[in-house]
Interface confidence: low
Amino acid sequence: DAHKSEVAHRFKDLGEENFKALVLIAFAQYLQQCPFEDHVKLVNEVTEFAKTCVADESAENCDKSLHTLFGDKLCTVATLRETYGEMADCCAKQEPERNECFLQHKDDNPNLPRLVRPEVDVMCTAFHDNEETFLKKYLYEIARRHPYFYAPELLFFAKRYKAAFTECCQAADKAACLLPKLDELRDEGKASSAKQRLKCASLQKFGERAFKAWAVARLSQRFPKAEFAEVSKLVTDLTKVHTECCHGDLLECADDRADLAKYICENQDSISSKLKECCEKPLLEKSHCIAEVENDEMPADLPSLAADFVESKDVCKNYAEAKDVFLGMFLYEYARRHPDYSVVLLLRLAKTYETTLEKCCAAADPHECYAKVFDEFKPLVEEPQNLIKQNCELFEQLGEYKFQNALLVRYTKKVPQVSTPTLVEVSRNLGKVGSKCCKHPEAKRMPCAEDYLSVVLNQLCVLHEKTPVSDRVTKCCTESLVNRRPCFSALEVDETYVPKEFNAETFTFHADICTLSEKERQIKKQTALVELVKHKPKATKEQLKAVMDDFAAFVEKCCKADDKETCFAEEGKKLVAASQAALGL
């Protein structure tokens, strides 16, 4: 339904509080370097304007599109050229090119200081002094660091953030109450951001068809009792929601996500038996709950897939009449029968099926040609099964930290050109697959592990895209979305890599390492490990282990010393010399 004023429509739909929060998120995701106060001022101006349009939809400029209104507002920022350089050129363009230009300048790794958590009492005072500003600041800081964060979900995080402070700032032991909650929100937030980044990459780099295929597979696993038509409707609506959010249309996205949650809850009888609890919650919790809901039970006595997709004489006729619908039905039927497969595996199987039909439906005897298509699936299924089995065994043997180290070495040897911080971040996240997924029974391991790895490898891809340094990474990232993980798994040691010059400064440590948290200390050690491999890519596991053990002992010794700094200086020189000797540098 057409509205005279889009801004008034969204303001009325969402209410002032959500409207302001979403505009703040949108602006912070576009102008990631702007100070908080500047963004708040812009948001207030937009909100006041929206209110005039609510009062009179025919008022001046109220008929303009949201992109025009928001873009015009962003382009009023005085320091745009000094702060953002060529992004300022976007302002010379007209919509829709201007918005596309802003989108292209979103930075997945903005040069922003690390968020340092103040003392609990300081945070509680700030929360009580001005709750509204405190929560806005949270939205702003998260949004500017995660420019693709799923905006309606960020409202849910903010609601939990507020609840944590409301509860814990009144508790006897504020820190004991608050810190675990903040840690949980931080970890969940990073995971949520990474998952959404994959959805946006899928839409932006591989198109709507790729995203819809992913959605058909995932929703069919989750709602196996729903009919194909129902799943297709949900996929269409979900695609619209994510297209809007990934495109910066956050008000439309939040509104449409809310409507989708409403539709799902009104039609839960024909969708899933697992939705009842979700649908009793308020909206933000409801939408989150639906997105995370467990798979419904598979209907009993589902017929064999072969009848419709292999044995039927009408396969090529059905395929020719509506290719995407027929492939969608194949994916739906396969996915609802296989909650034990990863989504990316299901998509590989669908791709293999499509390739086979393309070839066979042009052959002299199509049925004879595609009769054995399901046999081609066997190696595709076994490859991730075996890989997960091997890596879970390794994880159980080593524990998370050492498993991460094994992956650090593995990936540094595969793509040594990638920056050390990126290799550390990605390998640490890859290593978390162990504690996240290996505890699951066989039937849940693959969907957990391989779909998680897709999210992590996408982080590598988006970070690498900003400053490309490796043709091999570019190739694995761009050739096929569903084959990224097999592509990286198949990479061997890069024989063309010229080892990095040895730099003693890289291996010089100071007493500040002693006051770091266990996690930060691990990152320091893992950074050193990556640098070692870059200096000596052919180093054996044993050599690297010996050096890392020496390094751990060195840190432990100097952190216990009375004069820590002197210890780090003197013992550090000995360690570097010993390491060079051990590695033959």
Partner: antibody, heavy 120, light 110 residues
Framework: EVQLVESGGGLVQPGGSLRLSCAVS????????MTWVRQAPGKCLEWIGT?????NTNYANWAKGRFTISKDSTTVYLQMNSLRAEDTAVYYC????????????????WGQGTLVTVSS | DIVMTQSPSTLSASVGDRVTITCQAS??????LAWYQQKPGKAPKLLIY???TVASGVPSRFKGSGSGTEFTLTISSLQPDDFATYYC????????????FGCGTKVEIK
């Protein structure tokens, strides 16, 4: 300004009919469920019925048959037939939370009420 | 049908007191419960929904808790403006009696 204004109340004889109106402004009935609630003098609040965004209605068991809720683009109506003395009350219309941004269940906005007196 | 029982029906308290009102549902309603405040001659005003979510513009001294069949409204420090009647209300969109109100608790000056 977001508001609800009831009208149509007054004195009616037992067995008579009355149609109450609730004019809404500042929001759209296509986005919010609307509910009628009544309160007899000095008594509890009593739910009468609800009309959803799509126009479906749901009534309290005691109200079925005698009370009918309907709506057009900006007004919600309560048609009351075969009125009795015990129907004497202040009648409120109330808005549920936004169908999407909060469940259409808690009643987030109320009109000022209109008094209906059933007496001979 | 769901029946909501509120207690006490009347409560005498002074400014600054901590006040607790309870509401019991005849069957489990999960967290589908709201609390309202009503002053003489006025329409009810929403305070809490979904058992514990504070409605917009409501002071933080109002707190809702509970789930299933037992619910509580607490006013941490009673203010002069808080003397009124408080109602609980269940909502269940799967049931024919979508809404059921308690009969109210009148908070009066001691």
């Amino acid at each position: 300004e977001v508001q609800l204004v009831e009208s149509g109340g007054g004195l009616v004889q037992p067995g008579g009919s009355l149609r109450l109106s609730c004019a809404v402004s500042g929001f759209s009935l296509s986005r919010y469920a609307m509910t009628w609630v009544r309160q007899a003098p000095g008594k509890c609040l009593e739910w009468i019925g609800t009309i959803t965004t799509g126009g479906n209605t749901n009534y309290a068991n005691w109200a079925k048959g005698r009370f009918t809720i309907s709506k057009d683009s900006t007004t919600v109506y309560l048609q009351m037939n075969s009125l009795r003395a015990e129907d004497t009350a202040v009648y409120y219309c109330a808005r549920g939370g936004y169908v999407s941004y909060a469940d259409a269940t808690e009643l987030s906005l109320w009109g000022q009420g209109t008094l209906v007196t059933v007496s001979s | 049908d769901i029946v909501m029982t509120q207690s006490p029906s009347t409560l005498s308290a002074s400014v600054g007191d901590r006040v607790t009102i309870t509401c019991q549902a005849s069957q489990s309603i999960g967290s589908r419960l709201a609390w309202y405040q009503q002053k003489p001659g006025k329409a009810p005003k929403l305070l809490i929904y979904y058992a514990s979510t504070v409605a917009s513009g409501v002071p933080s001294r109002f707190k809702g808790s509970g789930s299933g069949t037992e619910f509580t409204l607490t006013i941490s420090s009673l203010q002069p403006d808080d003397f009124a009647t408080y109602y609980c209300q269940s909502y269940d969109y799967s049931s024919s009696s979508s809404y059921a109100f308690g009969c109210g608790t009148k908070v009066e000056i001691k």
